[in-house]
Each structure stands twice: as C-alpha cells, then as structure tokens.
Interface confidence: medium
C-alpha cells in the first residue's frame, strides 16, 4: 500500500529572465527512492538516479541545473516556460509518486510564490 505523500512548492510564479527552484519532497513512507524524473508536459527535463547520477535533457542543459537535493533549478526563464511540471518519484517497493507544480512566468515584477500543497 502506498502511504507516502509528496509535498511540492505548489503554484509558483517568477519573473521573465529570472530563475526558480522546483522542489518536491516525499514523506510518510520508508520506501527507497530509486529515481526522480522531472517532466514538463511532453518533455523530460531531467533524471536523478541512484546509479546513473543526474542526467539533464539536452534541450534544457543550458538553463537547467540539478539540485538543490532532488530538486531542479530553471534559469533564464521565458514566458514559454509557463505550465505544469511534474516530479515523478520511482520508489521501491511502493511504486510511483507524482507531484505537480504550476509555474507562471510573468513579464513584470509582480511574481509571488504560492502556498505549498500536498498530493497523496
């Protein structure tokens, strides 16, 4: 039975040209995390695997940095970066946990961070 929950940074906003940290945290389970995938709609951004290490998708390598921890840092943001991001935790023996973050990239300086929320 999957008992864990994923806490994410929730709905967040950032300024065009700036950077943002996408962060998820898996709690309430003793399952071992074997891999974390970071995905954006129809693209893989990055993989962090215990054996492979970090792997950043080539189309993002110039503006995506691994970390902190299992998180991901997006740099040089554009309005096209607005959208859903998913952290997918592959665990043993529980299976897969997925967290969702919605990022809005704003033209002006009115960017504010949203509240954290949990996905069971």
């Amino acid at each position: 039975m999957m008992t864990g929950t994923i806490e994410t940074t929730g709905n967040i906003s950032a300024e065009k040209g700036g950077s943002i940290i996408l962060q998820c945290h898996l709690s309430s389970t003793t399952a071992q995390v074997t891999q974390v995938n970071w995905e954006q709609q129809d693209q893989l951004l990055a993989i962090c695997n215990a054996d492979l290490g970090w792997h950043i998708s080539p189309s993002f390598k110039d503006r995506v940095a691994p970390g902190p921890g299992l998180g991901l840092t997006l740099q040089s943001l554009t309005v096209n970066d607005t959208g859903e991001y998913f952290c997918i935790y592959h665990t043993y023996p529980d299976g897969t946990y997925t967290g969702r973050i919605f990022l809005e990239v704003l033209e002006s300086s009115v960017a504010e961070h949203g509240a954290r929320f949990q996905i069971p």
Partner: antibody
C-alpha cells in the same frame, strides 16, 4: 547526422569474454543515455541496461548483472558492452541505441547491431 | 518486472486491409499524476534494427505515416495500421518504459498475403 557505429561480428569460445563497441557521432556524446538491447536469432528484444556517458553510471537488468559490464569513453565518444563467461545462450545480435528526447526508454537512433556467436 | 504480452503472435493480411494488434502489461503503465502512459511501439523489418513508431501509447514519432495509430491506457494497448502497405511487413513490438527493466513484448509478426 546522428550515427551509432557498432563493431563487427564476433566468433568467440565458451567461457571467454567479448567487448562490443558503439561509436557515436553527429551529436554530443555525453548529452544522451545509451541503452543496450539483446536479440537472439529469430527471437524478441531484451533490455540489457543503460549507461550515462557523462557520469559513467549504469543501470542493469537484473537478468544481466554479472554477465554484462557497460562502460563509456568520453574521449572517443564510444560506449562499450563487455560480456563475460560466455555460453551459447549469449549468442545473439546486440544493439546499442540512443534515447529519445522525451523518455529514456525510447530509441529512435540505433546501431546496426553486432552478431556475437559463441561456439567451441 | 513488468510482463508485456502481445497477441496475436502473427497475422497475415492483404495490402489495403486494416490491422489491429494487442499489447497487455502485467502492471499499469499509466502515471495517474500526469495522465501519461509509458508505452512505446516499434517496427522491426528483417535484417534491420527496430524503429520507433509510437510513444506515450498514442503519439506518432516524427516521420511515421499516419496509417499507424496507437491507443489504449493502463494495461491494454492497441496498434492499428489503417491500410496495410507491402512495406509494413515486419515484427511489431510494444515496450514498457514506465519502470526498469524496460521490458518488450514478444512481438507480432505481420505478413502480407
């Protein structure tokens, strides 16, 4: 254009080892994962494992642990698969493949295959 | 490991006919969090390496003719060839890329009458 050039046919004795090479060209070698797939004559496809040429880290199908060692040489943009303690069950065509932009299990670029025949 | 079961193992059709083949997985390949199915279809012609046709259960790879259609979700998937051409003679494999090891089905061999 992207190419994966594999080494030629190998005829080897039981109990020995063989090292199959996969030379990549047309792209930045460390930007993509390399997967290896086995196909016995007239049979289906078996996923052997994957290597991250950037870190040297690898993931293996449990079935091939102890049998296969995956390595990569960044200086020559070449991935290697070593098979040890060869038996007739290891006689097969071995393919290397570069992963697709979206998922690390998707292979649109393949080597031509290397036939390994184990015979006394 | 996730077991992929394909049926039929072979089929023989005339050019112009519609063909469907099935792939079933022993575990769901659907990630309910992002609503994606981690299933791919490959075509392997004699003497050649496999070629990626479909990923995400239903998205055609660039350059793949639109007569190839993937459908299904969870554990049941289908590859349909709308109007078979002579060049479609091949073995078709489905593949799990939801979790390691990335297992393949045993294949469906398509023969042209």
């Amino acid at each position: 254009q992207v190419q994966l050039q594999q080494s030629g046919t190998e005829l080897v004795r039981p109990g020995t080892s063989v090292k199959v090479s996969c030379k990549a060209s047309g792209y930045a070698f460390t930007d993509y994962l390399i997967e290896w797939v086995k196909q016995r004559p007239g049979q289906g496809l078996e996923w052997i494992g994957v290597i991250n040429p950037g870190s040297g880290g690898a993931i293996y199908n449990e079935k091939f642990k102890g049998k296969v060692t995956l390595t990569a040489d960044k200086s020559s943009s070449t991935a290697y698969m070593q098979l040890s303690s060869l038996t007739s069950d290891d006689s097969a065509v071995y393919f290397c493949a570069r992963y697709h932009y979206y998922g690390s299990g998707l292979f649109p670029y393949w080597g031509q295959g290397t036939l390994v025949t184990v015979s006394a | 490991d996730i077991v992929m079961t394909q049926s039929p193992s072979s089929l023989s059709v005339s050019a112009g006919e519609k063909v469907t083949m099935s792939c079933k997985s022993s575990q769901s390949l659907l990630n309910s969090g992002n609503q994606k199915n981690y299933l791919a279809w490959y075509q392997q012609k004699p003497g050649q390496p496999p070629k990626l046709l479909i990923y995400g259960a239903s998205t055609r790879e660039s350059g793949v003719p639109d007569r190839f259609t993937g459908s299904g979700s969870g554990t049941d998937f289908t590859l349909t060839i709308g109007s078979v051409q002579a060049e479609d003679l091949a073995v078709y494999y489905c593949q799990n890329y939801h979790s390691y090891p990335f297992t393949f089905g045993s294949g469906t061999k398509l023969e042209i009458k």
